[in-house]
Interface confidence: low
């Protein structure tokens, strides 16, 4: 089975993806990739964290979370129809065959041509002076100039209260479908 | 867009340390990787290690663990690689990337001789 | 310490076509080890070319392709330039470390 998740071009998108610690910092190596989980790994990786870091990503592909938490859904910056599809979030427990595996489906819809002034569900715009991520061509540059003076903590602690409110607000959006 | 900007060529004894700076100019880096890469005269790139500045960990090649030394200053969007207990065999261009190894600084030649 | 081993170097005329390979010493090459390709041009940094296997940079010229190609990562450039001429790096991953070839010495005759 698969959860939809719905987001219109331009916006970003995020797919939910969490596990549990075993201990605060003792972290799991996780895979994101786009097309659905083979028996091993990730297919066309767009993002890799290992048992400290994340240390590989593509452009316009970030985790917004607190992945030292355990957080680490997907946000896909700025979204074309080109990135509608299946995409794998792969938890890599050691053991054999102990991965936990998510096949997250996206479904990008086309802008609207009138924006109605509706409740703001991208993170990043939600709260432009907390954490903003801009692409700027090939340097992949990030920016994180309007942060404020807030530690991690609070960042996190931020993110955790929104991810909360938003993923409630997405079941009850009828964002998500479990099929 | 980003440019990655370092410190100037040095010349060092054996047995001393060296620090190379790596300063982001024309956006922040505290979210992304910062790569350090070492090329030998005649020889190919070698990874020795990484750092995300905005959580300060840093990760090692095996080869460097113990002697290399990899921090990140926010405050002045910096990246440092301290390499110690140098050795003739230091003698490197050392380089610092970023943003999935697309951003590159303009490479520091380390000369390690007695 | 894994070791990743490219073909010293190759030799192509101008227009053909050439692949270099990329391989790991612990087995066969997967899209899990992220594959990255470079170029790099004397006396210049490298110049990344290829990410996740086969994905070209906005600045990649069409002639370069990456895949994967019997258990190894591959770079194949085909209507080769004489401006073609460079060292080029492949660089994977391994939970936690990045290991660069030894490098391939693509020589353009003419």
């Known amino acids: 089975s698969e959860v939809e998740y719905r987001a219109e071009v331009g916006q970003n998108a995020y797919l939910p993806c969490f596990y549990t610690p075993a201990a605060p910092g003792n972290l799991v190596p996780v895979c994101w990739g786009k097309g659905a989980c083979p028996v091993f790994e990730c297919g066309n990786v767009v993002l890799r964290t290992d048992e400290r870091d994340v240390n590989y990503w593509t452009s316009r592909y970030w985790l917004n979370g607190d992945f030292r938490k355990g957080d680490v859904s997907l946000t896909i910056e700025n979204v074309t129809l080109a990135d509608s599809g299946i995409y794998c979030c792969r938890i890599q427990i050691p053991g054999i065959m102990n991965d936990e595996k998510f096949n997250l489906k996206l479904v990008i819809k086309p802008a609207k041509v009138t924006p109605a002034p509706t409740r703001q569900r991208d993170f990043t715009a939600a709260f432009p002076r907390m954490l903003t991520t801009r692409g700027h061509g090939p340097a992949e540059t990030q920016t994180l100039g309007s942060l404020p003076d807030i530690n991690l903590t609070q960042i996190s602690t931020l993110a955790n209260e929104l991810r909360d409110s938003r993923l409630a607000n997405d079941l009850r959006d009828s964002g998500a479908t479990i099929r | 867009q980003v440019q990655l900007v370092q410190s100037g060529a040095e010349v060092k004894k054996p047995g001393s340390s060296v620090k190379v700076s790596c300063k982001a100019s024309?956006?922040?880096?505290?979210?992304?990787?910062i790569y350090w890469v070492r090329q030998a005269p005649g020889q190919g790139l070698e990874w020795m290690g990484s750092?995300?500045?905005?959580?300060?960990?840093?990760n090692y090649a095996q080869k460097f663990q113990g002697r290399v030394t990899i921090t990140a200053d926010e405050s002045t969007s910096t990246a440092y690689m301290e390499l110690s207990s140098l050795r003739s065999e230091d003698t490197a261009v050392y380089y610092c990337?970023?943003?999935?190894?697309?951003?590159w600084g303009q490479g520091t030649l380390v000369t390690v001789s007695s | 310490q894994a070791v990743v081993t490219q073909e010293p170097s190759l030799t192509v005329s101008p227009g053909g076509t050439v692949t270099l390979t990329c391989a790991s010493s612990?087995?066969?090459?997967?899209?899990?080890?992220?594959p990255n390709w470079f170029q790099q041009r004397p006396g210049q940094a490298p110049r990344a070319l290829i990410y996740?296997?086969?994905n070209r940079h906005s600045w990649t010229p069409a002639r370069f392709s990456g895949s994967l190609l019997g258990g190894k990562a591959a770079l194949t450039l085909s209507g080769v330039q004489p401006e073609d001429e460079a060292d080029y790096y492949c660089?994977?991953?391994?939970?936690?470390?990045?290991?660069f070839g030894g490098g391939t010495k693509l020589t353009v005759l003419g």
């Open positions: 990337a970023s943003a999935s190894h697309t951003i």
């Open positions: 024309g956006g922040t880096f505290s979210s992304y990787t």
């Open positions: 750092i995300i500045p905005i959580l300060g960990t840093a």
């Open positions: 612990t087995g066969a090459v997967t899209s899990g080890y992220t």
């Open positions: 996740t296997t086969s």
């Open positions: 660089l994977l991953y391994y939970g936690g470390a990045w290991v």
